[in-house]
């Protein structure tokens, strides 16, 4: 019972820290001792340093009362636990003054990290680690640490799949402090987007710690948990350019204006998400490939905006594809080509259906943003035209998993509607039999964002051929 | 019946929650234009630790203003249920876990500035956006209070699924865990490996939801 009270209290403290983070500009900008990478068994000592710190309201505006109340709550004594009692008698923990001092924003971030760590430790102390015959706990270090990053959405992946062990990831800039993420996870990936978007021009290093599953206090033979470093990663120079999309084309006489969609990234400035163009500015260019629908001879043009104005022959239909390029880079300079868009395609009933499918997909994407659905779904990211119906059926099947796991009525309705639309359009082609195509279960499992992106691309294939 | 804790929030979940959800459901269309609306009410009244009772008391009072809107009978009925029901439940001693006396014991201003605003001005604030947000905050605040009464409820070990294993990180209420197909087996497309620790409201016993997972060779 006391343990549960302790857990509730710790969660409440996290809420209070989160609330104070909203008022960070109303706090006295004083540097306060902010423990990070706290030694094992010194968590309670570090916790008391956070509590003792002189966090103060700057006495400006209407928020003073709410800030003072929150600070008061932070300083309340938490319910005692065995671990806490044990640590209070440990004399070897660093003094509060020896910890690095940080302004309120970082102070609160570090306090939250410590609270999360303490909750995880508390949870894991209820289970038991696996031991080998000698009675010591076995863990293996992570390996093959790989950065997967597109348009700044950045995930660190590693191996192996854990057996009786869990992982915690840390990330830092070359000169910065380590920040822990994905505490005690059984996943072999960790989304570090939130960290890298703070400054995409910095160079980051991550490391993955391995702990025995039931006993995160226990460490490797040297008394330190095993860990492995990632390669260095500079988002601005290395994030892959996502596949661009042609937003529109408009013909006036012998000129055609082709517009490329300005992809939104997860990089924020002043609380708004920046587009790819906002982030890269003139460093980003687009190459347009265009050709007469009736021939294969391609022409090309470039722009450092998102628009092309090209000359065409009157009475001819053209097809277009674009590629994003960052000329100043030496690797990862180019995106894959956008789906092909052609002039003069009849917007028949089924094409209209597919267009509606895309807007339903966008709606689903918006709705799930606030939910934590960590499902991975079978995704065909490189659909061969001769297998597009088979691939589409897999996408529709897997879409139902999103509906199931969200438990959200409007997602459920949107998915249902989308499946009806897609099936109507598919049945309009008669019963197409495609051979030599992959079974759904043979496809790679991807996260929901990538799944939905690939889904949009296959729908565009249907639009282009309907 | 005031014994919400004993029945684990049954009164709230079978009466108030139903009405709140009905109201929110009927306001589904509202929202896209409300994204940037800032309402002073929520800056001044927050469902904060040890202030839940006060927040709900004020929010319930605020709801009454919306009864005068010429909406359908059903809508008004649900609003009345939420407003009156919240007030009644708050008056149940001990309901807001020792917080109520302190919260309601505070001196009450005769009328808050917010309430003095004319309905015309309220219109400017965008009635429906405010109402929707108010209902969402009330729901969240009640959930926060009642979460406390459910914290200690845990699930038994989850059921077994053919050709799959599960490693449970947490047995507590609302935990979400995943089964993993055994080596040589793959999740059948369209099936979900997720299971969730949920509460059976009738028996007040927690159980894991049945995953739709099928593991195939």
């Amino acid at each position: 019972q006391g343990q549960d009270r302790h857990m509730i209290r710790m969660r409440q403290l996290i809420d209070i820290v989160d609330q104070l983070k909203n008022y960070v500009n109303d706090l006295v900008p004083e540097f306060l001792p902010a423990p990070e990478d706290v030694e094992t068994n010194c968590e309670w000592s570090a916790f008391s340093c956070f509590q003792k710190a002189q966090l103060k309201s700057a006495n400006t505006g209407n928020n003073e009362r709410i800030i003072n109340v929150s600070i008061k709550k932070l300083k309340r004594k938490p319910p005692s636990t065995n671990a806490g009692r044990r640590q209070k008698h440990r004399l070897t923990c660093p003094s509060c003054d020896s910890y690095e001092k940080k302004p309120p924003k970082e102070f609160l971030e570090r306090f939250k990290s410590l609270l999360q760590k303490m909750i995880h430790q508390h949870l894991s102390s209820r289970t038991h680690g696996s031991e080998d015959s000698s009675g010591t706990t076995n863990t293996v270090a992570a390996y093959n640490l790989t950065w997967k990053s597109t348009n700044f959405k950045t995930i660190l992946e590693w191996e192996p799949k854990p057996v009786n062990q869990v992982y915690t990831v840390q990330i830092s800039t070359k000169s910065g402090d380590w920040k822990s993420k994905c505490f005690y996870t059984t996943d072999t990936e960790c989304d570090l987007t939130d960290e890298i978007v703070k400054d995409v021009k910095q160079t980051y290093l991550a490391r993955v710690f391995s702990y025995p599953a039931g006993n995160v206090e226990s460490t490797g033979s040297a008394g330190e948990p095993l860990y492995e470093n990632s390669p260095e990663f500079t988002p601005y120079l290395e994030t892959n350019l996502g596949q661009p999309t042609i937003q529109s084309f408009e013909q006036v006489g012998t000129k055609v204006n082709v517009t490329v969609e300005d992809e939104r990234t997860l990089v924020r400035r002043n609380n708004t998400f920046l587009s790819l163009r906002d982030v890269f500015g003139k460093d980003l260019i687009y190459t347009l490939y265009y050709w007469k629908s009736s021939s294969s001879g391609k022409k090309t043009a470039k722009t450092n905006t998102n628009e092309f104005l090209i000359d065409v022959d009157k009475g001819e239909n053209y097809c277009f594809s674009v590629q994003a390029v960052i000329p100043s880079r030496t690797v990862n300079r180019k995106s894959t080509d956008s789906p092909v868009e052609c002039m003069g395609q009849e917007k028949g009933e089924f094409r209209e259906n597919w267009v509606n499918v895309i807007s339903d997909l966008k709606k689903i994407e918006d709705l799930i943003q606030s939910m934590h659905i960590d499902a991975t779904l079978y995704t065909e990211s490189d659909v061969h035209p001769s297998c597009k119906v088979t691939a589409m059926k897999c996408f529709l099947l897997e879409l139902q998993v999103i509906s199931l796991e969200s438990g959200d009525a409007s997602i459920h309705d949107t998915v249902e509607n989308l499946i009806i639309l897609a099936n109507n359009s598919l049945s309009s082609n008669g019963n197409v039999t495609e051979s030599g195509c992959k079974e759904c279960e043979e496809l790679e499992e991807k996260n929901i964002k990538e799944f939905l992106q690939s889904f949009v691309h296959i729908v565009q294939m249907f639009i282009n051929t309907s | 019946d005031c014994d919400i804790e004993g029945k684990d929030g049954k009164q709230y979940e079978s009466v108030l929650m139903v009405s709140i959800d009905q109201l929110l459901d009927s306001m589904k269309e509202i929202g896209s234009n409300c994204l940037n609306n800032e309402f002073n009410f929520f800056k001044r009244h927050i469902c904060d630790a040890n202030k839940e009772g006060m927040f709900l008391f004020r929010a319930a009072r605020k709801l009454r203003q919306f009864l005068k809107m010429n909406s359908t009978g059903d809508f008004d009925l649900h609003l009345l249920k939420v407003s009156e029901g919240t007030t009644i439940l708050l008056n149940c001693t001990g309901q807001v876990k020792g917080r109520k006396p302190a919260a309601l014991g505070e001196a009450q201003p005769t009328k808050s500035l917010e309430e003095n605003k004319s309905l015309k001005e309220q219109k400017k604030l965008n009635d429906l956006c405010f109402l929707k947000r108010l209902l969402q905050e009330i729901k969240t605040c009640w959930n926060k209070i009642l979460m406390g009464t459910k914290e200690h409820i845990t699930c038994p070990p989850p059921m077994s699924v053919e050709h799959a294993d599960i490693w449970v990180k947490s047995y507590s209420l609302y935990s979400r865990e995943r089964y993993i197909c055994n080596s040589g087996f793959k999740r059948k497309a369209g099936t979900s490996s997720l299971t969730e620790c949920v509460l059976n409201k009738a028996t007040n016993v927690a159980h894991w939801t049945t995953p739709s997972l099928k593991c195939i060779r």
């Epitope: 190459t287 490939y289 470039k302 090209i310 | -």
Partner: antibody, heavy 117, light 107 residues
């Protein structure tokens, strides 16, 4: 360091074909297009076309369609240009060059193709 | 197709002189223009890209200016090794045409 090394000069009879190679080193081959440029004796530079090793797309000048065929072998980081139905006016120095999108920053040393009966 | 008209076709100057070559595009090409130098029997060498940017390792006496349809290339103080043929090239849209060249000779 970055280098583009072209195959040696060739003497061909009219009507024959010739394949000129351009081996790239010192950079990520698929990240840059390879351009081909012709310079006839005593004349200026003429753009033939380019190939994008990343996606295999080729773009040709109208004057060289059917005359030049551009290909790449990604495994050896080599670009090729095949010239068919050679005539005496195809006698020239042929250059390959690396495209950095805004210009051609590294050039091969040039391959002289002589067409003579 | 975009035509590039380079002038003059040839030019005599002395060491230390300031010389300017112009290049005119038949339609707007924004700043998608490059300048190259070529010596007899050698490959062309990049001097200026994106109309105004100096390529790596190129001396600062070389400069480029202009955008849209009118471009110029300047050598502020001629050095003996600068006597060669200079080409402009538009890299805006295919075919990526070159100017006909300007031969810079010693007076």
């Amino acid at each position: 360091q970055i280098q583009l090394v072209q195959s040696g000069g060739e003497v061909k009879k009219p009507g024959a074909s010739v394949r000129v190679s351009c081996k790239a080193s010192g950079y990520s081959f698929t990240d840059y297009n390879v351009y081909w440029v012709r310079q006839s004796p005593g004349k200026g530079l003429e753009w033939i076309g380019y190939i994008d090793p990343y996606n295999g797309i080729t773009i040709y000048d109208q004057n060289f369609k059917g005359k030049a065929t551009l290909t790449v072998d990604k495994s050896t980081s080599t670009a090729y240009m095949e010239l068919s139905s050679l005539r005496s006016e195809d006698t020239a120095v042929y250059f390959c060059a690396r495209d950095v999108t805004t210009a051609l920053d590294f050039w091969g040393q040039g391959t002289t193709v002589t067409v003579s009966s | 197709d975009i035509q590039m008209t380079q002038s003059p076709a040839s030019l005599s100057a002395s060491v230390g002189d300031r010389v300017t070559i112009t290049c005119l595009a038949s339609q707007t090409i924004d700043t998608w223009l490059a300048w190259y130098l070529q010596k007899p029997g050698k490959s062309p060498q990049l001097l200026i890209y994106a109309a105004t940017n100096l390529a790596d390792g190129v001396p600062s006496r070389f400069s480029g200016s202009g955008s849209g349809t009118d471009f110029s290339f300047t050598i502020s103080s001629l050095q003996p090794e600068d006597f060669a043929t200079y080409y402009c090239q538009q890299v805006y849209s295919s075919p990526f045409t070159f100017g006909q060249g300007t031969k810079l000779e010693i007076k």
